[in-house]
């Protein structure tokens, strides 16, 4: 399937809408410095190419590959050294090690002031004296804060931004309209992104081999009427749709998923009952709505899985002939059988038997080795049900800002040297966990928990990358992905952690706390808790709570006082005061 | 009533192909594994192959690559396609329910009463 | 994977006890893996014994199986006019591709 221009390809493809989006999007995702107006100009330059490309497909520089092209251009921008440094330093590589020397340099965490959401009627006045710039301001402001985001769907993203304006602007309350929408899709947003972020990190970190379980499993549960030659190809397509995009693909990417979306549609009868309702929808909805399909009903009567897979003498032949076909298999049935455990369990499971099987194959008699395989299952199940039901416990009883606070204190023992703001973004979204999960029925709680922690905890593994500190969440994060988190279930109280020395200034609070948002006040006190257990790793819950609740009282104190700022200066030196009597 | 019952055979010429059914009831088929073994007249039974529970075949080695077991569960029904047949492949062909449910164990405990199948020209 | 059955043949009267031997050229699986099977004609197969000895649902205890590894026999304790018919046996091995049966034992009433 070669054409003499892929650029042309692609825009006839894509079309031009979605051609000067993604190549927005990619080129945010690759410069994230750089301002607006300058992206802009770079993408109108590139769309005009390859206009004329279409028009020809000889005309000179159109037979390039899209790296080259697109690399080209980015290489054209004049302070590459001086915003970027050593960045700049890619540009005298030849493709394709250019382009894999600017996706090591994409920033999970680039320093840009966060979005501040303007007064609505700001908001929708410049939505309507510009629509189209308004649209790639937010393509631009959230592909540069996130480049890992999936960009199809940052598409769909931004036809829903478009949509909650069109709509709200018009409305008699445009706040109550506009914000409530607004908050769904920063939300929505920042799950997709992180959850994205997870698939690029397997394919990158652990090959594709590890990208294409998780997806047989996921894609068992969600189509187990399916036979395994179709979840096969539904898996080798995905594994291509998401490495493109990892890789900085994003054409090739979002023309492949819309293939993908076409197949699916066109094959629902082998695939899943429940496909019917999204493939009605326009392009960008149908592939969001397949992505996030509930999953079909089991079929009756499935065989035990004992018959083939434990009790069969031919299990080490079957397995020797073809070893990733057969564990393939044997995830497939497992995960088509139990929509009610993680992916990550299943995961653990397949990687188990392989285990066995490894062993057993090679014993002197095979059958009678790996004849309790599946027993052996049986803690690996307990042990995320367990968790599960501890921490749903702990979050009823606590509520969700207790909880996170919970999690606070036991992740920053485990793992001190961790900066405090990213144990405070990471233990706040653990916690969230218990709202998204415990009121599910308990047949979804494990899925939903275990397979959201992996998500969270592979932003610490990210963030930590970038800054390693503790060999302990290096451990965690590149010795099995399937294991990460038992890996960090499993961390004790570090023991060789010299405790933060205590810093006055740390827990010094000014009037400002007093205008603050809810949740930015919870920020800076969670703070406060983290700095303190990093001080007092040993301190005890009830220690801790004492410190905490006297800190509330203390804020809310001064910020009824008249004078507020009077009352932090008089009230806070005497808090921490008692605070660190209360630690001794 | 728990039975098997073969249909598909008949007359076919050398060379062409054949698929046999075997339709189970009183009993659903996804739990055993499924065989296929012929008699030629006058002669001895002969092992062709099974399918498993989960979708596993095995075939004797003669019949590889040219016999296809496949089942489909929600029809309770197993099938033997039969390509370039040869005049020595004529035979009453059984299908049968194997003890075992993921391999062969060589004690088939309900058969069909067969399909006669002639290759001729 | 060869299954030789001894004798091909074989004339008995009613009340005889008969005993039909099966030999195999390799081990059967799990040293037990044979069953013997009784054939009518016009009639498909049914199982009498599996796993060497084991007595299939529905079968006379007056027949009996024996025998481990390569060597096995069918014992009919007192012959019956209904168990004349011809005789298999089916041995499974360490593949189920290997699945084999022996030729045949026809047992005919004597005279």
């Known amino acids: 399937d070669t054409h003499k221009s892929e650029v042309a390809h692609r825009f006839k493809d894509l079309g031009e809408e979605h051609f000067k989006g993604l190549v927005l999007v990619a080129f945010s995702q690759y410069l994230q410095q750089c301002p607006f107006e300058e992206h802009v100009k770079l993408v109108n330059e590139v769309t005009e190419f390859a206009k004329t490309c279409v028009a020809d497909e000889s005309a000179e520089n159109c037979d390039k590959s899209l790296h080259t092209l697109f690399g080209d251009k980015l290489c054209t921008v004049a302070t590459l050294r001086e915003t970027y440094g050593e960045m700049a330093d890619c540009c005298a590589k030849q493709e394709p090690e250019r382009n894999e020397c600017f996706l090591q340099h994409k920033d999970d965490n680039p320093n840009l002031p966060p979005l501040v959401r303007p007064e609505v009627d700001v908001m929708c006045t410049a939505f309507h004296d510009n629509e189209a710039t308004f649209l790639k301001k937010y393509l631009y402001e959230v592909a540069r804060r996130h480049p890992y985001f999936y960009a199809p769907e940052l598409l769909f993203f931004a036809a829903r931004y478009k949509a909650a304006f069109a709509e709200c602007c018009q409305a008699a309350d445009k706040a109550a309209c506009l914000l409530p929408k607004l908050d769904e899709l920063r939300d929505e947003g920042k799950a997709s992104s992180a959850k994205q972020r997870l698939k690029c990190a397997s394919l990158q970190k652990f090959g594709d081999r590890a990208f294409k379980a998780w997806a047989v499993a996921r894609l068992s549960q969600k189509f187990p009427k399916a036979e395994f030659a179709e979840v096969s190809k539904l898996v080798t397509d995905l594994t291509k749709v998401h490495t493109e995009c990892c890789h900085g693909d994003l054409l090739e990417c979002a023309d492949d998923r819309a293939d993908l979306a076409k197949y699916m549609c066109e094959n629902q009868d082998s695939i899943s009952s429940k496909l019917k309702e999204c493939c009605d929808k326009p392009l960008l909805e149908k592939s969001h709505c397949l992505a996030e399909v509930e999953n079909d009903e089991m079929p009756a009567d499935l065989p035990s899985l004992a018959a083939d897979y434990v009790e069969s003498k031919d299990v080490c032949k079957n397995y020797a002939e073809a070893k990733d076909v057969f564990l393939g298999m044997f995830l497939y049935e497992y995960a088509r059988r139990h929509p009610d455990y993680s992916v990550m369990l299943l995961l653990r499971l397949a990687k188990a038997y392989e285990a066995t099987l490894e062993k057993c194959c090679a014993a002197a008699d095979p059958h009678e080795c790996y004849a309790k395989v599946f027993d052996e299952f049986q803690p690996l199940v307990e042990e995320p049900q367990n968790l599960v039901k501890q921490n749903c416990e702990l979050f009823e009883q606590l509520g969700e800002y207790k909880f996170q606070n919970a999690l606070l204190v036991r992740y920053t023992k485990k793992v001190p040297q961790v900066s405090t703001p990213t144990l405070v973004e990471v233990s706040r979204n653990l916690g969230k966990v218990g709202a998204k999960c415990c009121k599910l029925p308990e047949a979804k709680r494990m899925p939903c928990a275990e397979d959201y922690l992996s998500v969270v905890l592979n932003r610490l593994c990210v963030l930590h990358e970038k800054t390693p500190v503790s060999e302990k969440v290096t451990k965690c994060c590149t010795e099995s992905l399937v294991n990460r988190r038992p890996c960090f279930s499993a961390l004790e109280l570090d023991e060789a952690y010299v405790p933060k020395a205590f810093n006055a200034e740390t827990f010094t609070f000014h009037a400002d706390m007093c205008t603050l948002s809810e949740k930015e006040k919870q920020v800076k006190k969670q703070t406060a808790l983290v700095e303190l257990v990093k001080h007092k790793p040993k301190a005890t819950k009830e220690q801790l709570k004492g410190v905490m609740d006297n800190f509330a009282a203390f804020v809310e104190k001064c910020c009824k006082a008249d004078d507020k700022e009077a009352c932090f200066a008089e009230e806070g030196p005497k808090f921490v005061a008692a605070s660190q009597a209360a630690l001794a | 009533e728990v039975q098997l019952v073969e249909s598909g055979g008949g007359l076919v010429q050398p060379g062409g192909s054949l698929r046999l059914s075997c339709a189970a009831s009183?009993?659903?088929?996804?739990?055993?594994?499924m065989g296929w073994v012929r008699q030629a007249p006058g002669k001895g039974l002969e092992y062709i192959g099974i399918?498993?529970?989960?979708?596993?075949?095995y075939y004797a080695s003669w019949a590889k690559g040219r016999f296809t077991i496949s089942r489909d569960n929600s029809k309770n029904t197993v099938y033997l396609q039969m390509n370039s047949l040869r005049a020595e492949d004529t035979a009453t062909y059984f299908c049968?329910?194997?003890?075992?449910?993921?391999?062969?164990?060589?004690?088939?405990?309900?058969w069909g009463q067969g399909t006669l199948v002639t290759v001729s020209s | 994977i060869q299954m030789t059955q001894s004798p091909s043949s074989l004339s008995a009267s009613v009340g005889d006890r008969v005993t039909i031997t099966c030999q195999s050229s390799?081990?059967?699986?799990?040293?037990?893996?044979l069953s013997w099977y009784q054939q009518k004609p016009g009639q498909p197969p049914k199982l009498l014994i599996y796993d060497a000895s084991d007595l299939a649902s529905g079968v006379p205890s007056r027949f009996s199986g024996s025998g481990s590894g390569t060597d096995f026999t069918l014992t009919i304790s007192s012959l019956q006019p209904e168990d004349f018919a011809t005789y298999y046996c089916?041995?499974?091995?360490?593949?189920?591709?290997?699945?084999?049966f022996g030729g045949g034992t026809k047992l005919t009433v004597l005279g």
């Open positions: 049968a329910r194997d003890r075992h449910g993921g391999d062969s164990s060589g004690a088939f405990y309900l």
């Open positions: 009183g009993f659903s088929l996804s739990s055993n594994a």
């Open positions: 390799e081990s059967v699986y799990s040293n037990n893996q």
């Open positions: 089916a041995g499974g091995f360490s593949s189920s591709s290997d699945t084999a």
């Open positions: 399918i498993s529970v989960g979708g596993f075949t």
